[in-house]
């Protein structure tokens, strides 16, 4: 059965300077491959976070993703700025061999509105 990626909130509002959580769960870790968060769509989308060990300032995972059965890939963005506004997508990839990883499923997106302090 095909993996499903669920982002339960269609939108969240956060005051500038505060933190917000973007929720994402998957129904399976198979086929193997990373899960990444992006802002925007298409060629111009921006990588926000990848669950592959790199450090991303202001962003951290919410659950303990080192649990081998973890299906929760929610993230917390701290010290939100107006530039963080946009629609965020949680995306499951299948690992590539010699080619790049292949996107196989995306969540429906969560729009982040940043309110003036």
């Amino acid at each position: 059965t095909e993996v499903k990626v669920t982002q339960p909130e269609k939108s969240v509002s956060v005051a500038a300077g505060d933190s917000t959580i973007l929720n994402c769960t998957v129904t399976s870790l198979l086929p193997v491959g990373p899960i990444r968060w992006y802002r925007g769509v298409g060629q111009s989308r921006l990588l926000i976070y990848s669950f592959t060990g790199e450090h991303f300032p202001r962003i951290r995972n919410v659950s303990d993703t080192t649990k081998r059965n973890n299906m929760d890939f929610s993230i917390r963005i701290s010290n939100v700025t107006p530039e963080d506004a946009g629609t965020y997508y949680c995306v499951k990839f299948q690992r590539g061999s010699s080619e790049p990883d292949t996107e196989i499923q995306s969540g429906g997106g969560t729009e982040v509105y940043v309110l003036a302090k």
Partner: antibody, heavy 118, light 107 residues
């Protein structure tokens, strides 16, 4: 620099218990899953146990489940392996290893030798 | 269980390939570990199929396709003589596994 230093090995008699320790430094220990791997004399590598970063979830192969217990103390940056009812087949060099995001290993300790002999 | 050849040999400067099979591409990731003497230190040369730690020379590379992972050493050197273990993690069983090791002899 990442450093993993095992200790607690030695000579024990069959049926006895032993607790190994692995002191970690040079990285945020509480953010990484960890594992124990052993190598019997003249043999290959055998994975023994894994533990999540927070310590709540543990994993074992059937060969040691119920006899070995992995644990960690994140306040002390230390990983442990409790080994009970040891037999001669447990004689090996025991390594601790740091896990990558997909549960492979990127850093290893130098190992500690456990000899089970009467 | 992962399967790899017991031994390979090469002259300095040649390219060496060590294959490791047995893992399902759908659920498996591979790594490669170097050990220069039995019971001595282990060094990760490849993780996540093809990722090389920053302190490992670029002559080491890895790939995975189907049920087989391959470690390639391009322009092998005398100091590369060691036992190379392939290892894997299976997302369907939450278990790690290793091959029996391949002894690389540089002639």
């Amino acid at each position: 620099d990442v450093q993993l230093v095992e200790s607690g090995g030695g000579v024990v008699r069959p049926g006895e218990s032993l607790r190994l320790s692995c002191a970690a430094s040079g990285f945020t220990f509480s953010s990484n899953a960890m594992s124990w791997v052993r190598q019997a004399p003249g043999k290959g590598l055998e994975w023994l146990a894994g533990i999540s970063a927070g310590g709540s979830d543990t994993y074992y192969p059937a060969s040691v489940k119920g006899r070995f217990t992995i644990s960690r103390d994140n306040s002390k940056n230390t990983l442990y392996l409790q080994m009970n009812t040891l037999t001669a087949e447990d004689t090996a060099v025991y390594y601790c290893a740091r896990e990558t995001w997909n549960h492979l290993f990127d850093y290893w300790g130098l190992g500690t030798l456990v000899t089970v002999s009467s | 269980a992962l399967t790899q050849p017991a031994s390979v040999s090469a002259n300095p400067g040649e390219t060496v390939k060590i294959a490791c099979s047995g893992g399902d591409y759908y659920s498996y990731y591979y790594g490669w570990y170097q050990q220069k003497a039995p019971g001595s230190a282990l060094v990760t040369v490849i993780y996540s199929d093809d990722k090389r730690p920053s302190d490992i020379p670029s002559r080491f590379s890895g790939s995975a396709s189907g049920s087989t992972a391959t470690l390639t050493i391009t322009g092998v050197r005398a100091e590369d003589e060691a036992v190379y273990y392939c290892g894997g993690y299976d997302y369907s069983t939450y278990a790690n596994a290793f091959g029996a090791g391949t002894t690389l002899t540089v002639l």
